[in-house]
Structures are given as C-alpha cells and as structure tokens.
C-alpha cells in the first residue's frame, strides 16, 4: 500500500494521530494517551482497483473485471479507497469499577490501504 506523500492523489495511507483527550476518553484510558490510527484517502481509478497490492480481496479483482467492461450491474459501481490491513494495539484502561484492564484491541491501526 502507498504512503501519502502529497504528490499523488491515488489511494494511499495518510498518517493521523488520535489523542484520547480530544475525544474525551482520557479520564479512563490510562495508556497510551493517543496513537497513530491513520486513514485512507485518494482516488481509485479503474486501472488501479483490483491490482495486486492495492486490492481489498480477490473478490474486488474479479468484480473490477466486469466493471471495466461495463457489465451490469457493476458499470456504475465506484471503487473506494479503504483499509486493507489493520493492526491491533494494547490498551490499559479503567472499567466501570475503576479496575485496571489490559486488552489487545483489534483493528486499531490502519497499516495499508487499497481500492475495493
């Protein structure tokens, strides 16, 4: 997956830092105080969608073959720039009774982006 560098507008991963203070969770999340969640941004022209390394799945690739040839009902479907690889992260936080919980939270960090 591409990292956004400001030079291309093709689907890429953009760095984004989430601060738990910003969203009002800092009174019960102990650690970390924030993290790089990242997000996906950019265009998915038909020649990019479904190409190796940028596709969401085999399904995207085969559907894209039909879309490129104008087959109904796929002709008007737009390919979207979405996360294709996500990573978990460990968190330390208080539950309702102020007990400290350590948990690995799935799908916290966007690692790679691709066209659906």
């Amino acid at each position: 997956g591409l990292e956004c560098d400001g030079k291309v507008n093709i689907c890429c991963k953009k760095q984004f830092f989430v601060s738990f203070k910003d969203i009002g969770w800092n009174d019960w999340i102990i650690a970390p105080s924030g993290y790089h969640a990242n997000y996906c941004e950019g265009e998915c022209p038909s020649h990019i969608a479904g190409t190796s390394g940028s596709s969401l799945s085999f399904h995207s690739t085969v559907i894209n073959h039909y879309r490129m040839r104008g087959h109904s009902p796929f002709a008007n479907l737009k390919s979207c720039c979405v996360p294709t690889k996500l990573r978990p992260m460990s968190m330390l936080y208080y539950d309702d009774g102020q007990n400290i919980i350590k948990k690995d939270i799935q799908n916290m960090i966007v690692e790679e982006c691709g066209c659906s």
Epitope: G24, W25, N26, D27, Y93, D95, D96, I101, I105
Partner: antibody, heavy 123, light 108 residues
Amino acid sequence: QVQLVQSGAEVKKPGASVKVSCKASGYTFFGYSMHWVRQAPGQGLEWMGVINPSSGDTNYAQKFQGRVTMTRDTSISTAYMELSRLRSDDTAVYYCARARDIAALGLGAFDYWGQGTLVTVSS
Amino acid sequence: EIVLTQSPGTLSLSPGERATLSCRASQSVSSSYLAWYQQKPGQAPRLLIYGASSRATGIPDRFSGSGSGTDFTLTISRLEPEDFAVYYCLQYGSYPRTFGGGTKVEIK
C-alpha cells in the same frame, strides 16, 4: 467529581410538550453517551433512548419513536430530552444517566445518574 | 428486545439475613452485560454490580453478583438496615436497553 444536574419539576397539560435538561460536569461531556430513563409513580424503570453527544446520533425505544427528541449542546455540556403529545400516563420522574458505549473496550453500565425531574401531566 | 424477569417481586427478610434476588433474561445477555441497581424512595438508582459480577466503586463486599447467559443472581450476604430498598437488573449489551421489573426487599 462527576455530576448530572437536571432541570426542575414541570406541570403540563395533555397534548403539550416538555423539554428536560441535564447538565454534566466533572468529566468530558462528549466522551460518554447520555441515556434517558423514566419511572412512573410506584412503577419500575423504563429506558427511553440515548444520544451520543459527540456525533448527535440517537437511538430511541420503539415505544417513544416519533414523540421523543434527544439533543445536546456540547458548548454547555448539556443534554436535552423533549417529549411531545403528552398524555396522563407520561407522568413520571425522568432521569438522565451516562454510560460508556465503546464496544471494543467493553460497554458501560449507567454509572452516574441525574437527580430526576418530575413531569406531571394533568388537565 | 430482551425481556428481563425479576423474582421474587417482594422479599421479606430481617437484618442479618441473606437475600437472593433473581433476574432471568428471555435471551442470552451479550458478554454478561448485566448490571444491578439499588433504589431508595425519592432517590436515583445507584449502580451496585456491572458485568454480572463486578462490584462498582464504593459498594460493600456483602453485595455480590453471579450468573451468565440468561440467569443472573444478586446476593446480599447479611442484610444491613440501609439495604432495604428496590433492586433492578439492567441488560446493556444490546438495544433497546431493558430493565427488570424490580424486587422490593422489605423488613420482615
């Protein structure tokens, strides 16, 4: 410390509307969902709905759909519950209660409650 | 929606006795998202137990919760005079949130 302070008692006529406020302090208002629960005299607790103060998204109990509106003003950390077309059986104490609603980290119970607002509907 | 049925409706006991309150769900409560509340006349409910068995902050250890799936129990090991009140269970694992009808614990 966390506090939820509700507006004062109201007396309304059938068919009218009532708007109850709930002012939050001691925590970051938009970090927790705000639920509304009511209790008719001598009866049990009844969940009415919830608002996410960050997004304004709401989820209402089917019974109140079309009659209840939950809103918020993040600038003054206040949630509102408006109930329209009041009937005599809407006479109850109305409570706001906060909860953590983040599924990935475990949902939260209603840990802090307002003191309640008595709404009396009478002709 | 999940219907919660509490039993008994009223429990008449003396101080020092053990109270056992039941809450039965019409379908399984997700991740044991079940809480117990105590309510006294003219007051807002107070959280006692969350997650079926965890005590809320400041709640004495004579209060304990147990159960999973559809059957939950609140136990008060030795009733103190201040424990005579109405107790409600709440499921908060799915929408709509639902409460049980309550159990009144009264002095015998």
